[in-house]
Amino acid sequence: ARNGDHCPLGPGRCCRLHTVRASLEDLGWADWVLSPREVQVTMCIGACPSQFRAANMHAQIKTSLHRLKPDTVPAPCCVPASYNPMVLIQKTDTGVSLQTYDDLLAKDCHCI
Amino acid sequence: ARNGDHCPLGPGRCCRLHTVRASLEDLGWADWVLSPREVQVTMCIGACPSQFRAANMHAQIKTSLHRLKPDTVPAPCCVPASYNPMVLIQKTDTGVSLQTYDDLLAKDCHCI
């Protein structure tokens, strides 16, 4: 169950999809990826206040226990709910080829 | 790909399964759950240093970009990789019934 999408911390402060531009060098991929030279990495960033985009029952439990024991139990964390696949031109010993990666770019986000 | 399981921060400091004892009151469940009165909640807690239990390519990217832009990109987060189901005796308008919840207790953990 995806709980409330209203962010009590103000617009854009809570868990949501962000895009970060990164070069192959930034990613440490220059030795095994030929293209693209730059990737628009979509990732999940932001706070997870009480019940905001709670992914499941476990996330709701985590919220309750974090409120009670903040030093022991961390707040839920903003992570991908699903991914968009991406193709890379990959260098191998036998040459270059197109390879699809299913878990590279976040598609949407939730708190867990 | 689950990357290295060696924790560079010292034993028990990195992302792993913890058990937290919680009452129905702690969980805010007293009004809709009859039993159990207390739950041994298994949850994922701990740091996610570079490539420790990286869940996938996205987690590896996050590690690289966090190193470059720590104020913009957070480190990967310790979350459940899978869950153990649990049965609860649930109160309803028509009485009580056994209900199984698949996403309540963490089974194992990874960094994402």
Epitope: S35, P36, N84, P85, M86, V87, V96, L98, L105 | -
Partner: antibody
Framework: QGTLKESGPGILQPSQTLSLTCSFS??????????VSWIRQPSGKGLEWLAH???????RYKPSLKSRLTISKDTSRNQVFLKITSVDTADTATYYC??????????WGQGTTLTVSS | DIQMTQTTSSLSASLGDRVTISCRAS??????LNWYQQKPDGTVKLLIH???NLHSGVPSRFSGSGSGTDYSLTISNLEQEDIATYFC?????????FGGGTKLEIK
Amino acid sequence: QGTLKESGPGILQPSQTLSLTCSFSGFSLSISGMGVSWIRQPSGKGLEWLAHIYWDDDKRYKPSLKSRLTISKDTSRNQVFLKITSVDTADTATYYCARSAYGMTDYWGQGTTLTVSS
Amino acid sequence: DIQMTQTTSSLSASLGDRVTISCRASQDISNYLNWYQQKPDGTVKLLIHSASNLHSGVPSRFSGSGSGTDYSLTISNLEQEDIATYFCQQYNMFPWTFGGGTKLEIK
């Protein structure tokens, strides 16, 4: 590995509209970076790039033919289409579709032949 | 449009020979060049991507080189199955353009 197969009418009369279909498997056009191109080759001549469609529905056309070309896709059915209006005998050729990403056009279909004749 | 010129339209060589096919662009294409092989039955296969990168599965006797406007494809030890027409193609900018092709025949 990607496999692609073109299909078309085979024969058209001048001024008619050509509708080509590229059916593919082994990849998806929902994948970021992926695209499909159409290329043609008149018998005994060279290759001519016509159009390209990206995963995000961005399209590119050969400028001299742009007014006559329309490329489109049905991502869920793994198909790409090309329409050429007002065909002429100069459009008689073998038409290929090919998978492409970042300029790497790695797999081509076997081609479908079109003859324009009155 | 960028013009791609393959000056040699046909080439005759013996089995075992080293064969070089050249391609010139009308402007600098920054190594954004593919080489293709087209068999007599019309089948087209990618050999080289980005001027010098062998496509996976292509025999290592094929190699590509060049920079700026001048590029070449080399077959180091010609085999019977290499009888085909070879095309260069630039993808530096749209519209993508091909060379006229070089038909390779056995002496």
